[in-house]
Interface confidence: low
């Protein structure tokens, strides 16, 4: 195991000072997490070039909203969001959107401030296709009986244990190389009883647990 | 550790003009927004200028449109304000600060003073 | 432009609670962040986007933002926080300072 540790201590510090060398450097984020932290997730089209607005540190970008999957509370009857708006520099963290494909439909997990759509390049969002069907499934359901109960705790580093039976170690970092893996892909942290969070399988069946994955704290 | 140290400040009479440097080290210079604050004797911070980590977006506060200019040379690490027109409400320490990821300004410089007096 | 007020003072025992309240129109739909500033030193951000703390930054400061109004709460309050501290705010032109709150440990 020491061997094993040794190398990704080694991987993660050198992950790390790449990280710190940028101005925006992004923590690596579990998809519920993102569902849980934002305030509006929605399926959208981007329409265009960002629109600088004058005399501001904001540019904005003009979207066709398809679905919302969480916000309507926040939101309440309103129709839908035409605009995301987003730092103009990227060294803010600000979003630079590269596809020119208007009609490939996104997945958007942003922040409602004044009534608008705010994303970063911190923000889950991701091509609604990329994301697999079990993912695409927890958006618009599962994650969110998850929110405000469980949490996704992320071991970075070995060793690393939990620090409460609401939190799921999060370990596709360690064991995959890559915040995209099976966690993240295939299961949701969701609560097994009032006192306790496990996680669950996306599949067919929501009973089967992931082996190993929760460790004794 | 990050380090940002400015000078050029000093004495000079209204009308005059007044340049400011902020020399930067222990980060990825080019890759940061940077922004001046300063703060009169006695009183609370006033956000003055702010420019883009390629130099290539600049912003100012309405109080020194047209009057000031930031600007920053990224093979020097060093970033630049200068001053012109100037007046005496314009006394005030002139600090040297970068922007975290999003808007907070995460680490500051200790100031230079510059004095706007006949 | 917003405009941000903050008490002119605040005073706490060491040991209690201090709470530092910022208010502008609308407030809590735009982020917050919060400065401490010791006499002839530099600000140092404590909190930034409402209420996240920047590493190195004790857990006992801590904000929130809703409505009109930002807090920077600071539980157990030691000597050492004994500072100026000042909300700073952004609508879509620019920062904005609030007045300052000079904090006395008691």
């Known amino acids: 195991m020491a061997p094993f540790a040794s190398l990704a201590s080694g991987i993660l510090l050198l992950l790390s000072l790449i990280a710190s060398s940028k101005a925006c450097s992004c923590a690596p984020t579990h998809p519920q997490t993102a569902f849980c932290n934002s305030d509006l997730v929605i399926r959208a089209k981007f329409m265009g070039s960002p629109e600088i607005i004058e005399t501001t540190l904001y540019q904005r970008y003009e979207i066709k909203m398809t679905k919302m999957l969480k916000g309507f509370d926040a939101v309440g009857n309103a129709t839908g969001f035409r605009f995301a708006y987003t730092p103009a520099m990227e060294s803010l963290c600000g979003y630079v959107h590269k596809s020119q494909n208007r009609s490939e439909e996104f997945l958007i997990a942003g922040r409602l401030r004044n009534g608008n759509l705010h994303i970063t390049a911190c923000s889950f969002l991701v091509p609604w296709h990329n994301l697999s069907p079990a993912q695409q499934k927890a958006f618009v359901k599962t994650y969110s009986a998850g929110c405000g109960v469980c949490t996704v705790f992320p071991c970075s580093a070995i060793p690393c244990k939990l620090e409460s039976d609401s939190h799921c170690l999060w370990t596709d970092q360690i064991l995959m190389g890559s915040e995209k893996g099976y966690q993240s892909d295939h299961f949701a942290c969701l609560p097994r009883n009032p006192d306790l969070c496990t996680w669950q399988y996306l599949g067919v069946s929501m009973t089967r647990s992931l082996p190993l994955a929760k460790a004794e704290a | 550790q990050v380090q940002l140290v400015e000078s050029g400040g000093g004495l000079v009479q209204p009308g005059g003009s007044l340049r400011l440097s902020c020399a930067a080290s222990g980060f990825t210079f080019s890759s940061y927004a940077m922004s001046w604050v300063r703060q009169a004797p006695g009183k609370g911070l006033e956000w003055v200028s702010a420019?883009?980590?390629?130099?290539?977006?600049?912003y100012y506060a309405d109080s020194v449109k047209g009057r000031f200019t930031i600007s920053r040379d990224n093979s020097k690490n060093t970033l630049y304000l200068q001053m012109n027109s100037l007046r005496a409400e314009d006394t005030a320490v002139y600090y040297c600060?970068?922007?975290?990821?999003?808007?907070?300004?995460?680490?500051w410089g200790q100031g230079t003073l510059v004095t706007v007096s006949s | 432009d917003i405009e941000l007020t903050q008490p002119p003072s605040v005073s706490v025992a060491p040991g209690q609670t201090a709470r530092i309240s910022c208010s502008g129109d609308?407030?809590?739909?735009?982020?917050a962040s919060w400065y401490q500033q010791k006499p002839g030193q530099a600000p140092v951000l404590v909190i930034y986007?409402?209420?996240d703390r920047p590493s190195g930054i004790p857990e006992r400061f801590s904000g929130s933002n809703s409505g009109n109004t930002a807090t920077l709460t600071i539980s157990g309050t030691q000597a050492e926080d004994e500072a100026d501290y000042y909300c700073?705010?952004?609508?879509?032109?620019?920062?904005?300072f609030g007045g300052g709150t000079k904090l006395t440990v008691l």
């Open positions: 700073q705010s952004y609508d879509f032109n620019f920062h904005v």
């Open positions: 986007d409402d209420s």
């Open positions: 600060a970068r922007y975290g990821a999003y808007f907070g300004l995460d680490y």
């Open positions: 420019i883009s980590g390629s130099g290539g977006s600049t």
């Open positions: 609308a407030l809590g739909d735009k982020y």
